[in-house]
């Protein structure tokens, strides 16, 4: 009978190995190792047995020894088993970014490594063990999914094997593929709200805010704002899982009409978008024409209204009859019209939104000179030595100059107050004189004497 | 002056309808005009309006379901295809008016008509 | 649009009390704000419009006030006929999509 010693071994790919082989006889007729691995015999040996050293062992092995002894031939195996960690040990790429609330499938591929029966493919979040399995095939995949948080943003994910030798080898071997960093992120089925107004003049500024809630993460998402062709440059402020976009707009002639409003809020690979109808008006202020804007008391006046051709105008308050862009009445020029205002105001609807505008203009009318009794009395009866102030108005546009003189040369003190003295007292030429000429009127001031008893 | 609707009627699901509102006293080219209805236990609802020209918009809500035209005197809401949901009264109001004070001219349902039933049942 | 927002939902005031509505609208409509009052079976009546003028024939118990975006309406010496549901409407646009009346206010009279 032959004996093998060790009956089995376990050795590193590459690695040595000595085995003895021994007859059951004392003086075996012959003693040897069959095997196609590299083998030195270790001399001396013994009558009955031989040791060799077999070197460079690259796979699993079974050396054989065999022994012819009188009583028969026989033989013996040695189980050499080779062990080598994975040459590859790697994680599958992740997807750029990954929703939250939706499966993520891990998968890591193990290329090598023996004795696959000892090796375990563990898939990691961090330190924490996801699925342990057995490594099958060459090369080996091992998958798992896993559902996905807003916790697993920025965490860390690998694949580790385990090569487990023990009791035989009692070290545990590890190999750990690079870590790949898993980007999550969360756009909620809702569309972005947009405030914005609904019309718009030409020239003039609006704003426009878009925002939207539950992010994640808010600071990843990218805004897009737009009016037609136009890119619009928001403000963008972050709450906590909330952002807010806000613009302001300046729309031209050549943009009026009906625009697109877009809203794009853009995280991971998803986008949410809204689009609003956004009407762009051009409304000038009505024109209020006067055929003159002065004019002499008497004079036919023509007051015109006119706006933009979709408006409806109200002249002072009366409206267009029919109601229209275009209002005008005919008024005789009086005293009383001279600095009056005419408005003209005009109202226009865009895409059902009002819009108002307005114009004033001023008519100015030319009248007098003018000196009334009302206002400049022909006759005035004072006690002598009372305290009196001479009144005498005159009227007129432009405003008239007024002197009153007695004898061509003594000054009636109009609006001041005077003494009444025996000097005051006779007739008055008063004279009011402007562009437009002069109208004169007789004063005349009548002084009473005290009674002394 | 006065509007007033017609056309109200027990209709089956699906087969459109078309009520008319009748103004009398004043011009329709002069003023814009708004159906409004009020569905059983529920609040005035706008439905549309259409404009001294001719123009329409419509609530959100009424968009495609209904249409709103004019003629001369009168003016026209058909209900495209109606459900059940579409059983109301059924209003028609002038809507326009002025402030002398401001020269402005504004929406305001100044004049109404009685009312239409409408009534969409299997 | 112009959202309106019409508080309270419903309201029970005695005879002879003093019931207080209010209308929000969501953006300014300076003073184009008519108040409706509308009882089952008859067309809505106009109440006040221009947010304050009094509209011909109604009762000076009724007051409206505001402008911009907060509008009230006030009810002052309540009798037994104005039990009825009130409406708030925005008089500034009719634009696509446009909410043009408040929710409604019902007034219950004890």
């Known amino acids: 009978q032959t004996s093998v010693f060790p009956p089995e071994v376990i050795l590193p790919r590459g690695g040595s190995v000595k085995v003895n082989c021994s007859a059951s006889c004392d003086q075996p007729i012959s003693l040897g190792m069959e095997t196609p691995l590299p083998k030195k015999e270790i001399l001396p040996g013994g009558n009955n047995w031989k040791m060799y050293e077999l070197s460079n062992v690259q796979e699993d092995s079974q050396p054989m020894c065999y022994s012819n002894c009188p009583d028969g031939q026989s033989s013996a195996k040695t189980l050499l088993t080779v062990y080598w960690t994975p040459e590859r040990v790697e994680l599958a790429p992740l997807p750029p970014w990954q929703p939250v609330g939706k499966n993520l499938t891990l998968r890591c591929q193990v290329e090598g490594g023996a004795p696959r029966a000892n090796l375990t493919v563990m898939l990691l979040r961090g330190e924490k063990e996801l699925s342990r399995q057995s490594a099958v095939g060459e090369p080996a995949e091992v998958t798992t999914t896993v559902p996905v948080g807003r916790d697993d943003h920025g965490a860390n994910f690998s694949c580790r094997t385990e090569l487990d030798l023990r009791p035989y080898v009692l070290k545990l071997f590890e190999n750990t593929s690079a870590p790949h960093q898993l980007q999550t992120f969360d756009l909620p089925a809702t569309p972005p709200q947009l405030v914005s107004p609904q019309v718009l003049e030409v020239d003039t500024q609006g704003t426009v805010v878009c925002s939207l809630d539950g992010l994640f993460p808010v600071s990843e998402a990218q805004v897009s704002l737009a009016l037609g062709d136009q890119k619009l440059n928001p403000t963008i402020t972050y709450g906590n899982n909330s952002l807010s976009a806000k613009a302001s707009v300046k729309v031209t002639a050549e943009e009026e009409g009906t625009q697109q409003l877009l809203c794009g809020v853009m995280l991971g690979n998803q986008t949410q978008e809204t689009r609003q109808t956004v009407t762009i008006y051009s409304f000038p202020a009505p024109n209020v024409n006067l055929t003159k804007p002065e004019v002499s008391e008497g004079t036919e006046v023509i007051v015109e209204c006119e706006a933009h051709p979709r408006a409806k105008v109200m002249l002072n308050g009366v409206p267009a009859q029919p109601p229209g862009p275009r209002a005008q009445f005919l008024l005789k020029a009086t005293p009383e019209d001279n600095g009056r205002s005419f408005s003209c105001s005009a109202t226009l609807e865009v895409a059902g939104q009002l819009v108002h505008k307005n114009q004033t203009r001023e008519l100015r009318v030319l009248y007098g000179p003018r000196l009334d009794e009302k206002d400049c009395p022909g006759n005035w009866t004072w006690p002598e030595n009372s305290q009196q102030t001479p009144m005498c108005q005159a009227w007129g546009n432009p405003l008239p100059q007024l002197k009153c003189l007695k004898d061509g040369t003594f000054p009636l003190p109009i609006g001041q107050s005077v003494t009444v003295t025996r000097d005051l007292e006779g007739t008055y030429l008063c004279q009011a004189r402007s562009t437009r000429g002069e109208v004169t009127r007789e004063v005349t001031v009548n002084v009473l004497s005290p009674r002394y008893e | 002056q006065s509007v007033e609707e017609s056309g109200g009627r027990l209709v089956t699901p699906g087969t459109p309808l078309t009520l008319t509102c009748t103004a009398s006293?004043?011009?329709?080219?002069?003023?814009?005009m708004s159906w409004v209805r009020q569905a059983p236990g529920k609040g005035l609802e706008w439905i549309g309006i259409i404009s001294d020209s001719g123009t329409t918009y419509y609530a959100s809500w009424a968009k495609g379901r209904f249409t709103i035209s004019k003629t001369s005197t009168t003016v026209d809401l058909k209900i495209t295809s109606p459900t059940t949901e579409d059983t109301a009264t059924y209003f028609c109001?002038?809507?326009?008016?002025?402030?002398?004070?401001?020269?402005?001219?504004?929406?305001?349902?100044?004049?109404w008509g009685p009312g239409t039933l409408v009534t969409v049942s299997a | 649009g112009y959202d309106m927002t019409q508080t309270p939902a419903s309201v029970e005031v005695a005879v002879g009390g003093t019931v207080t509505i209010k209308c929000q609208a969501s953006?300014?409509?300076?003073?184009?704000l008519v108040w409706f009052q509308h009882k089952p079976g008859q067309p809505p009546k106009r109440l006040i419009y221009k947010a304050s003028t009094l509209a011909s024939g109604v009762s000076s118990r009724f007051k409206g006030s505001g402008s911009g975006t907060h509008f009230t309406l006030t009810i002052s010496g309540v009798e037994s006929a104005d039990a009825a549901t009130y409406y708030c409407?925005?008089?500034?646009?009719?634009?696509?999509?446009?909410?043009?009346f408040g929710g409604g206010t019902e007034v219950v009279v004890k």
């Open positions: 409407q925005q008089g500034y646009s009719r634009s696509d999509g446009e909410h043009v």
């Open positions: 953006q300014s409509i300076n003073s184009w």
């Open positions: 109001a002038r809507d326009w008016s002025y402030d002398s004070s401001s020269g402005y001219y504004y929406y305001d349902m100044d004049l």
């Open positions: 006293g004043f011009s329709l080219s002069n003023y814009y």
